[in-house]
Amino acid sequence: NFMYSKTVKRLSKLQEYQQYYPSLTCVMEGKDMEDWSCCPTPWTSFQSSCYFISTVMQSWTKSQNNCSVMGADLVVINTKEEQDFITQNLKINSAYFLGLSDPKGWRHWQWVDQTPYNKNVTFWHSGEPNSPDERCAIINFRSEEWGWNDVHCHVPQKSICKMKKIYI
C-alpha cells in the first residue's frame, strides 16, 4: 500500500513536469534507493545539479534568457570538481558563457543566482580578468587548461545552463 501510494505520487509529479520537459532521465538514489533524481533529457547530471551545453551562439543576456526559458540559469561554478565535470563535455576550440558578470565594470563580479563571489574559488586564466570593459565571463581552453576569461557581453558565444535536479 505504501509503495503503491508512493508510485502514484511519482506519476503525478512526472505528469506535472512533463509539460515543461518532454523527457526526463531519472536515477534511483538515497540510502534505501527509494528516491529518484531526474534531469531533462539530454542534460547531464553531477551531484545535485543538471547541466546543458548550449551550442547556439548568443550574447550573454540572451544566453541567460535562453537558460531561464528552460527553467535554469547560466552555470554557477562552485568547485574545481564541478568545473572538471563540465569541461569533459566542452569543445577545446570554443568558449562558453558562465553565469558570472560585472555589470558596472567595477570588478565586482556576481553570480546570476546570487551565490557570493569567492575570490578563493575562481579559475581565471593567468592575467584575467584584464579589462573593466569586458563585463562577462566565459570558460575556454588556453595554455593546456580550462579557465575563465572576461569578455564583451554582446559578442555571441556558446553557453552552459545549470538547474537543480528534479526529485520525485
Epitope: H152, C153, H154
Partner: antibody, heavy 120, light 107 residues
Framework: DVQLQESGPGLVKPSQSLSLTCSVT?????????WNWIRQFPGNKLECMGY???????YYNPSLKNRISITRDTSKNQFFLSLNSVTTEDTATYFC?????????????WGQGTLVTVSA | DIQMTQSPASLSASVGETVTITCRAS??????LAWYQQKQGKSPQLLVY???TLADGVPSRFSGSGSETQYSLKINSLQPEDFGNYFC?????????FGGGTKLEIK
Amino acid sequence: DVQLQESGPGLVKPSQSLSLTCSVTGYSITSAYYWNWIRQFPGNKLECMGYISYDGSNYYNPSLKNRISITRDTSKNQFFLSLNSVTTEDTATYFCVRGGDYDDGGFAYWGQGTLVTVSA
Amino acid sequence: DIQMTQSPASLSASVGETVTITCRASGNIHNYLAWYQQKQGKSPQLLVYNAKTLADGVPSRFSGSGSETQYSLKINSLQPEDFGNYFCQHFWIIPYTFGGGTKLEIK
C-alpha cells in the same frame, strides 16, 4: 564616428577566390564588437556570412561550408573576406558591418557595399 | 536556423497614409527583432531594434510591435522619403537571418 569601407575587385571568374577588404576608421577593431560580412543578392535577399570578433575568434555561416575565411590586420584596422570556389551564385553586393550594438539587437553601422560579379 | 517570413513583398501607398509590414519567425525570437530601411544603391539603415525601440534619429512616425513569433512595423503618415525597401532581421541566435524584404512604392 565609426566608418566602414569595403574594397576589392568588382569582377571574379568562376572557380576563383573572391577577396575583399573592410577598412574601419573611428574605432579599433580590437577594442570591442564583432565585425561581419553580409551580402545582398540581386533579388535583394540578405545573408550573414560570418564575422571576426574583437578578440580574433570567428564564426562562419554553415551554409558557406569550408569556402569562407575572415581574417584581420590589426595594425591597419582592417578585416578581410576570402571566399573560395566562387560560382555565379556568389554575385552580390558585399557589406562589412559592425555587430554588437544595442546589446546585440541590431546592426547600426554598415559600409556602403561593393558589388562583386562572378562571370567568365 | 530561424526562418523569417516577411509580408507583403510589395506595397503601394500614398503620402499621408499609414502602412504596416509584418514579419513571422519560425520560432520564438523573444523580441530580438530589428527593422531596416534601404534606399536604392545604399546600405540598410537601422530603424528599430528589440522589436520596438527606435534607433537614434529615427522619426516617431515609425513604430515596432509584436512578441514571440509575430512582429510588425507601422509607418504613420507616410512621407516621400519613406519609400524604399524594408527588411526585418532576428537577433536571437546566430546566424541572424533576414526577411525577404518589402518594397514600399508610391501609389
